[in-house]
């Protein structure tokens, strides 16, 4: 058993049929010595008396808010949550496996630049009685500070018969050094509590590996005289690290016909313009990627050819 | 070239070669996630590689003030990786074909380090750890870790030379 926060405790249980469970001793936080009784949740049934209560925690029915009273007055509470371990593996019932970039990916994170700011998100089908708490650091043995905000519900989607809820959190490294080569990964830890179930999820990454620039901005076309060619131009996204002579991007320009089956013409360039042939009913799209490190491409910025 | 008196390197040449290094490093080990290398036991592996750290003056301001600190750090790293890529970590099994980008990577690391340090001038170099794994799986794991680490190192070096070529070239 360990303390998650004040008056909230997590009991770690090996979860299998007829498991013996864990013996837990609760102590009433009071100077009083006698006349103390204990109850669980809203029930008025007295579970025991005395300053301490010993219970055998085996299942969710044994978890909940234990309260000690004296003469009708509440003295203190202890909320017991369960953390299940099945076949040596901690349960992951609360969050959905996003399976990208690999199986058992529950947290996904992205950064728009090298400033040390990043966003993580996760998915669940649970809509109520759900709380999250997020902590982060750079490195684990001698951790350096990363400050995370509160997790918020950022999207709701309907998937088949189910509703899916996306939560996200923003974090900022306290003393970020955008130009340095990271040697210690960022660690993100999410505590999830659904009713009386506790689970924790972690992710470990370098900012450089989760970089995904915003799409290029101000995408414009300039027809070239007496030609089917156009000059496409664009700018670095506002959110990208500066100076651009140091934090450089590379770009992919694509001409795509109306039908998805039509052949795509692609050009790669380090410049912020390119000359391409504009076909009727086609569109021109540009996306960006760090020039020197192959992290994710941005989403496409697009304009119609006409 | 970064000569003893502290004059400028051939920024544009360094820029071109460092960008080629980035491409080669990703050709040699293109996959980011086919195995989570940090999960695979980090004890004596690549913790000793020289990293370009915050105080090494490789940021735009530091380069403007005095690029020598940064160039020395980059040179140190290039020599370190060049020695690793020439070691039995890369020559033993699993077998690399002669067309492997590792060969070109090795030659290009040497080429860039020579651009930075002409003959007769010696910056101190970091000792390369004596890693000689006997099993193919240990060697392969180490290869992947070294290449992932090299990708990060050459990305910073390439940014330095791109910025230098754009803002510090005579």
């Amino acid at each position: 058993i360990w303390e998650l926060k004040k008056d909230v405790y997590v009991v770690e249980l090996d979860w299998y049929p007829d498991a013996p469970g864990e013996m837990v001793v609760l102590t009433c936080d009071t100077p009083e010595e006698d006349g103390i009784t204990w109850t669980l949740d809203q029930s008025s049934e007295v579970l025991g008396s005395g300053k301490t209560l010993t219970i055998q925690v085996k299942e969710f029915g044994d978890a909940g808010q234990y309260t000690c009273h004296k003469g009708g007055e509440v003295l203190s509470h202890s909320l017991l949550l369960l953390h299940k371990k099945e076949d040596g593996i901690w349960s992951t019932d609360i969050l959905k496996d996003q399976k990208e970039p690999k199986n058992k990916t529950f947290l996904r994170c992205e950064a728009k630049n090298y400033s040390g700011r990043f966003t993580c998100w996760w998915l669940t089908t649970i809509s109520t009685d759900l709380t999250f708490s997020v902590k982060s650091s750079r490195g684990s043995s001698d951790p350096q500070g990363v400050t995370c905000g509160a997790a918020t519900l950022s999207a709701e989607r309907v998937r088949g018969d189910n509703k899916e809820y996306e939560y996200s959190v923003e974090c900022q490294e306290d003393s970020a050094c955008p130009a340095a080569e990271e040697s210690l990964p960022i660690e993100v830890m999410v505590d999830a509590v659904h009713k009386l179930k506790y689970e924790n999820y972690t992710s470990s990454f370098f900012i450089r590996d989760i970089i995904k620039p915003d799409p290029p901005k101000n995408l414009q076309l300039k027809p070239l005289k007496n030609s089917r060619q156009v000059e496409v131009s664009w700018e670095y996204p506002d959110t990208w690290s500066t100076p651009h002579s140091y934090f450089s991007l590379t770009f992919c320009v694509q001409v795509q016909g109306k039908s998805k089956r039509e052949k795509k013409d692609r050009v790669f360039t380090d410049k912020t313009s390119a000359t391409v042939i504009c076909r009727k009913n086609a569109s021109i799209s540009v996306r960006a990627q760090d020039r020197y490190y192959s992290s994710s491409w941005s989403e496409w910025a697009s304009v119609p050819c006409s | 070239r970064a000569v003893p008196g502290g004059s400028s390197p051939a920024w544009t040449q360094c820029q071109q070669l460092s960008q080629k290094l980035c491409t080669l490093a990703w050709s040699a080990h293109p996959l980011v996630g086919h195995m989570d290398l940090r999960e695979e036991g980090d004890e004596e592996t690549t913790n000793d590689v020289p990293h370009i750290q915050c105080g090494d003056g490789c940021d735009p301001q530091g380069l403007r003030d005095n690029s020598q600190f940064c160039l020395q750090r980059i040179h140190q790293g290039l020599i370190f990786y060049e020695k690793l890529l020439g070691s039995d970590i890369f020559t033993g099994e699993p077998s690399l074909l002669p067309d492997s980008p590792v060969g070109q990577l090795h030659a290009s690391l040497l080429g860039l380090s020579q651009l930075l340090q002409p003959e007769g001038h010696h910056w101190e170099t970091q000792q390369i750890p004596s890693l000689s794994p006997s099993q193919p799986w240990q060697r392969l794991l180490l290869r992947f870790k070294i290449l992932r680490s090299l990708q990060a190192f050459v990305a910073v070096a390439a940014r330095v030379f791109a910025h230098g070529a754009a803002t510090l070239s005579p």
Epitope: - | S27, E93, S95, L97, D99, S100, P101, P136, W137, L140
Partner: antibody
């Protein structure tokens, strides 16, 4: 896109020789090794060897040394595999293939195969 | 030479079944193992490399696992178009060697 086109099927007498060609296109011929494999009827694959056109250096499976000669003609982007002293057990489909660019020998592109039949 | 012992040599399964083919290397090959699919009269097609990395365009029902000496190719839900021969291949050590193949049929 990368393509490997092999010469047509051959029927040969025991003791004779055969030269199979593999014309490459869609990439820089001198940049990559070209490998040869064979597959006897109803059998698995056997790796014969490769040539690296850039330095014209072949490497052979010891089991095929003296039996096989692998060469390359840079001017036509073509690799060749010559089999000598043919015996009935050399009857097989012979494939050329090129590996991944990362320098390890898993094979992405294959020729269509050339059936060599050795029969008296 | 490294021997790649592949089993079973043939197997018959129903559409939707989970199918597993194994390969045992005679010594440590790290994860330098690829798997190929060869349909009758066709050339081998790369499915998996580095023991578990799916090649571009290969359906997600194909997966590979294993390291050092023991390797597995799994088809999570067999489809009619998966009827073929399957080969494992080690590229750790010269001469590169292949398993003897597994002929997969639909019941």
């Amino acid at each position: 896109q990368v393509q490997l086109v092999q010469s047509g099927a051959e029927v040969k007498k025991p003791g004779s020789s055969v030269k199979v060609s593999c014309k490459a296109s869609g990439y820089t011929f001198t940049d990559q090794t070209i490998h040869w494999m064979r597959q006897a009827p109803g059998q698995g694959l056997e790796w014969i060897g490769y040539i690296y056109p850039r330095d014209d250096s072949p490497k052979y499976n010891e089991n095929f040394k003296g039996k096989v000669t692998i060469t390359a003609d840079i001017s036509t982007s073509t690799a060749y595999m010559e089999l000598s002293s043919l015996r009935s057990e050399d009857t097989a489909v012979y494939y050329c293939a090129i590996p991944d660019r990362s320098g390890y020998a898993w094979f992405i592109y294959w020729g269509q195969g050339t059936l060599v039949t050795v029969s008296s | 030479d490294i021997q790649m012992t592949q089993s079973p040599s043939s197997l018959s399964a129903s559409v939707g079944d989970r199918v597993t083919i194994t390969c045992k290397a005679s010594r440590d090959v790290a994860i330098a193992v690829a798997w190929y699919q060869q349909k009758p009269g066709k050339v081998p097609k790369l499915l998996i490399y580095w023991a578990s990395t799916r090649h571009t365009g290969v359906p997600s029902r194909f997966s590979g696992s294993g390291s050092r000496t023991d390797f597995t190719l799994t088809i999570s839900s067999l489809q009619p178009e998966d009827v073929a021969d399957y080969f494992c291949h080690q590229y750790s050590s010269y001469p590169f060697t292949f398993g003897s193949g597994t002929k997969l049929e639909i019941k």
